[in-house]
């Protein structure tokens, strides 16, 4: 759930990393209400995810490593 580029809540679904091409960090102290990871999918969707959840941290790590290796 997002509005004016701010996530207002988090997805209930677990996204597979193979569908994700990148992510953006949303910080609560930078104009939005909550901290979030915004995953960008191959289908050009933006999905708001809870940055505290293990699967989210895991994908962030995988994507960060991919960028480093490019």
């Amino acid at each position: 759930a997002s509005n004016f580029d701010c996530c207002l809540g988090y997805t209930d679904r677990i996204l597979h990393p193979k569908f994700i091409v990148g992510f953006t960090r949303q910080l609560a102290n930078e104009g939005c209400d909550i901290n979030a990871i915004i995953f960008h999918t191959k289908k050009k969707l933006s999905v708001c995810a809870n940055p505290k959840q293990t699967w989210v941290k895991y994908i962030v790590r995988l994507l960060s490593k991919k960028v480093k290796n490019m």
């Epitope: 597979h16 959840q53 293990t54 699967w55 941290k57 994908i59 962030v60 790590r61």
Partner: antibody, heavy 120, light 107 residues
């Protein structure tokens, strides 16, 4: 209550490989992340890497990259950690630990540990 | 990688004492720090998660606080079964890292 049952102690020669297993029961294996943590005698805890079985992709600590392989078999609810090119410093207790992928704590459940001794 | 510096590395205390252990992170770790207890020959046990939340079934004499880079773990009144080694863990970002441990011994 999730239980993680590890394979038995191993004695290995320097330069060889070891493969330790961790079988999960009492929960949905696909909804867990499994990590491997080692502890050398008298030393602290060290995260080696982990895997989310439904993702299939493992995630390793830089120190072990290229020497460790973590895999998971969803059909048997078992995770594996293989460490190659063993040296004496790899003598340690190897723990598997798990947590829900939708949870916020990585290590809710632990195996009892597997002692791997590397000696010529 | 975020490095965690735990202090002290060991301490001696008596039953009933208040014990405090600190954990300093080399980088921002939000409140994503947990505390584990380990007894000799046993696997670690989670006591505190998210810096200050008490794990289910853990006695309330254990508590945690802090955020950012400074974290504190407290045992309000040390019991005989609390003599063990305690580790902090950050799971803010991979790779996950532990502090070096604090051994709590009987005075």
């Amino acid at each position: 209550q999730v239980q993680l049952v590890q394979s038995g102690a191993e004695v290995k020669k320097p330069g060889s490989s070891v493969k330790v297993s961790c079988k999960a029961s009492g929960g949905t294996f696909s909804s867990y992340a499994i990590s491997w943590v080692r502890q050398a005698p008298g030393q602290g805890l060290e995260w080696m890497g982990g895997i989310i079985p439904i993702f299939g992709t493992a995630n390793y600590a830089q120190k072990f990259q290229g020497r460790v392989t973590i895999t998971a078999d969803e059909s048997t609810s078992t995770a594996y950690m293989e460490l190659s090119s063993l040296r004496s410093e790899d003598t340690a207790v190897y723990y598997c630990a798990g947590g829900s992928i939708t949870g916020t704590t990585p290590f809710d459940y632990w195996g009892r540990g597997t002692l791997v001794t590397v000696s010529s | 990688a975020i490095q965690l510096t735990q202090s002290p590395s060991s301490l001696t205390a008596s039953v009933g004492d208040r014990v405090t252990i600190t954990c300093r992170a080399s980088q921002f770790a939000s409140n994503d720090v947990g505390w584990y207890q380990q007894k000799p020959g046993k696997a670690p046990k989670l006591l505190i998660y998210a810096a200050s939340s008490l794990q289910s079934g853990v006695p309330p004499r254990f508590s945690g606080s802090g955020s950012g880079t400074e974290f504190t773990f407290t045992i309000s009144s040390l019991q005989p079964e609390d003599f063990a080694t305690y580790y902090c863990l950050q799971d803010y970002t991979y790779p996950l890292t532990f502090g070096q441990g604090t051994k709590v011994e009987i005075k």
